[in-house]
């Protein structure tokens, strides 16, 4: 049997070697013109796929195989020319130098060439199946695209429309956003940058202390001068006093000493009849030393010893130990009545605390203990609280149990640092705790995210400075 | 855009007082605070009060209190600075802004073009 | 109230050069800070805010840096419309402004 064989010479073209008996014969066959080879990476099912196309991706996969088509084609053409032209010469050939068995083969090798031919036409109308397949899937797309297109450009203008609309509500909401996250990053910034500065302040103004406790003794030297000047002072005073009496007296024998009415506290002065608030003359406990003090004849059945006052930022309440100890201020605006006096005063009998707190909204609240008293200056006046009720948290707001008093030069806290100094302000600082009433006063708009202010935390949180506080102190018994 | 528009220049005599506009535009007039700048030729810059267009609520500086009022007209988006008892020293450019903050107190970010006030007997 | 001092109070510079510009604040002021640029005739211009942050169609050759007392304004390259007058303000502790700093051609 004839034995038929394909390959490639060293120049890239097809050969078809046809081998029958002795005799062995060699068609050189024409290569397609930029087409693919079978390496390519061109599949022919590829053009099968039920996946949508990207429309960019199908129109160029279409050109690619109207190129093949056409270059399929015209090496057909090619084909069927050559073929035919060497089949005249062969045949002429054959007739005039071979036998008629040799006819025979040549016939043979036609008939296996046109089979080919045969074969590559049919799988060429397989693939212009194929394609004509894939354009219809194509146009079936690009009209769905379409469909779809049209549909999602009337859907954009109907959000563009909507979105023009939310765009002036979302301009003003976008600005509130980034201000406030702006204020956010600053805000964590500046609490670090704070903590910083703080550690460097506190260095500072340890050295400051050592030069102050200098001047301190100096001033404490200077004032047992005084005191005694004084003591020697108010005996005089005493002595003339006796003998304007005695030579009153004497004078006039009918006329009665007057009785001198003094009042301990604010309750005294209600029960006395004085029933308007005001600033009162009170004395201090087992003495004759007066302090003044504002009265609350008014709320919650009056009575009320005003002990603090925080309103308006008018008063600068970073005093000295001395200061926090005898009173500072206005009764009638900001103050601080005095430690010594409360101390005194609250160790007599039981007295209740009201601390009355006002924020910057609108809002009140209030903390009440049932039993107050503040220990005496050997232990810091150190405070004692018991029995919490009230609205403006449920958890003390003044660290329990109670701390000694601080001051920025008198520091009594639990603290590495020096509360008083970092914070500003005397107050019962723990470490440093959550509460100073007695911090720097800050206005509206400027009162949050401010580690000194005027701080409840129970109430208002770590970093809200309020508006107005008022601490007042009534006899239990009222 | 945002806009402040302030009332023109005022010519006054000292112990009188004078009122000073400031028309907003371009945002909501109740939003933000605004503030009042005043200004010295050749000097630097003073603050002295503010108001909050939604409440009426006024916070002065301390060396201004009880000589200037603010207030405000919410239908015409409009804050005013009333300054009373004029001296020769009240004779600088003031300035309305608009303070940027929301919830707390931020930086200028719109200016009016100013309003020159002159107080000479 | 808080204290705002800037310096140098002129500054001579060329253009392309850079400027570096200082405010000091008598107390901590977090990052409460801002800068203004005043030309003549014209109302202040917010430049830089929360010490660093620029505000809305500032060129970013203006760069400002720090926190609690000391804050620095730069311009990286001055071009000609940057010579001006410049402010610092705090807003941490009621609102107080520096005097000012005068950028003029060398």
């Known amino acids: 049997y004839n034995n038929f064989r394909k390959s490639m010479d060293s120049i890239g073209k097809k050969q078809y070697q046809v081998q029958h008996g002795s005799c062995s014969y060699t068609f050189l066959l024409p290569e397609m013109d930029n087409c693919r080879s079978s390496s390519s990476p061109y599949v022919s099912n590829a053009v099968q796929r039920d996946a949508p196309l990207e429309y960019d991706d199908s129109v160029q996969r279409l050109q690619v195989l109207e190129n093949i088509m056409e270059n399929n084609t015209q090496w057909l053409m090619k084909l069927e020319n050559y073929i035919q032209d060497n089949m005249k010469k062969e045949m002429v050939e054959i007739q005039q130098n071979a036998v008629q068995n040799q006819t025979a083969v040549m016939i043979e090798i036609g008939t296996n060439l046109l089979n080919q031919t045969a074969e590559q036409t049919r799988k060429l109308t397989d693939v212009e199946a194929q394609v004509l397949n894939q354009t219809t899937r194509l146009e079936l797309q690009l009209l769905e695209h379409s469909l779809s297109t049209n549909k999602l450009e009337k859907q954009i203008l109907d959000q563009t429309s909507e979105i023009n609309k939310l765009q002036d509500k979302n301009s003003f909401l976008e600005k509130k956003v980034l201000a406030m996250e702006d204020k956010h990053i600053i805000q964590l910034q500046s609490i670090k940058e704070e903590k910083d500065q703080l550690q460097v302040l506190v260095s500072k103004q340890n050295s400051i202390i050592e030069e102050l406790e200098k001047k301190i003794v100096t001033a404490t030297v200077n004032n047992s001068v005084l005191q005694k000047q004084q003591h020697d002072l108010m005996e005089t005073v005493n002595n003339l006093l006796t003998m304007m009496s005695t030579s009153n007296s004497a004078k006039d024998p009918t006329v009665a000493k007057e009785e001198q009415i003094s009042f301990r506290d604010c309750a005294e002065v209600f029960k006395s009849g004085h029933t308007t608030n005001g600033i009162y003359t009170l004395t201090f406990p087992n003495s004759t030393e007066e302090i003044k003090a504002y009265c609350d004849m008014e709320a919650g059945g009056g009575g009320w010893t005003i002990i603090q006052r925080r309103e308006d930022g008018s008063v600068d309440f970073q005093r000295t130990w001395k200061e926090y100890k005898v009173g500072f201020g206005n009764p009638s605006g900001e103050y601080w009545l005095g430690n010594e006096f409360v101390s005194q005063l609250t160790n007599q009998q039981r007295y209740v605390l009201k601390i009355h707190l006002k924020d910057w909204e609108g809002n009140e609240a209030y903390s009440l203990y049932e039993h107050f008293y503040l220990s005496s200056e050997e232990l810091n006046y150190r405070i004692h609280l018991k029995g919490l009720t009230g609205t403006a948290g449920k958890i003390s707001s003044i660290s329990q149990p109670g701390n000694d008093f601080s001051t920025k030069d008198g520091d009594n806290d639990k603290c590495i640092c020096k509360c008083s100094q970092m914070l500003t302000g005397g107050w019962w600082f723990d470490a440093c705790g959550p509460s100073n009433l007695n911090g720097m006063y800050y206005p509206q708009r400027q009162n949050t995210n401010k580690f000194n202010g005027i701080k409840w935390y129970y109430w208002k949180g770590s970093g809200y400075s309020l508006k107005a506080t008022t601490m007042m102190i009534r006899p239990a018994d009222f | 855009q945002v806009q402040l528009v302030q009332s023109g220049a005022e010519v006054t005599k000292p112990g009188a007082s004078v009122k000073v506009s400031c028309k907003a535009s371009?945002?909501?007039?109740?939003?933000?605070?605004m503030y009042w700048v005043r200004q010295a030729p050749g000097q630097g810059l003073e603050w002295m009060g503010w108001?909050?267009?939604?409440?009426?609520?006024?916070n002065y500086a301390q060396k201004f209190q009880g000589r200037v009022t603010m207030t405000r007209d919410t239908s015409i988006s409009t804050a005013y600075m009333e300054l009373s008892r004029l001296r020769s020293d009240d004779s600088p450019v003031y300035y309305c802004?608009?303070?940027?903050?929301?919830?707390?107190?931020?930086?200028?970010?719109?200016w009016g073009q100013g309003t020159l006030v002159t107080v000479s007997s | 109230e808080i204290v705002m001092t800037q310096s140098p109070a002129t500054l001579s510079v060329s253009p392309g050069d850079r400027a570096t510009l200082s405010c000091r604040a008598s107390?901590?002021?977090?990052?409460?800070f801002a800068w203004y640029q005043q030309k003549p005739g014209q109302a202040p211009r917010l430049l830089i805010y929360?010490?660093?942050t620029r505000a809305t169609g500032i060129p970013a050759r203006f760069s400002g840096s720090g926190s609690g007392t000391e804050f620095t304004l730069t311009i990286s390259s001055l071009q000609s419309e940057d010579f001006a007058v410049y402010y610092c303000?705090?807003?941490?502790?009621?609102?107080?402004f520096g005097q000012g700093t005068k950028v003029e051609f060398k």
């Open positions: 802004a608009r303070d940027q903050g929301i919830a707390a107190a931020g930086p200028f970010d719109y």
């Open positions: 371009g945002y909501t007039f109740t939003a933000y605070h």
């Open positions: 108001i909050n267009p939604n409440s009426g609520g006024t």
């Open positions: 107390q901590s002021v977090s990052s409460n």
């Open positions: 929360g010490s660093s």
């Open positions: 303000q705090q807003y941490h502790y009621w609102w107080t």
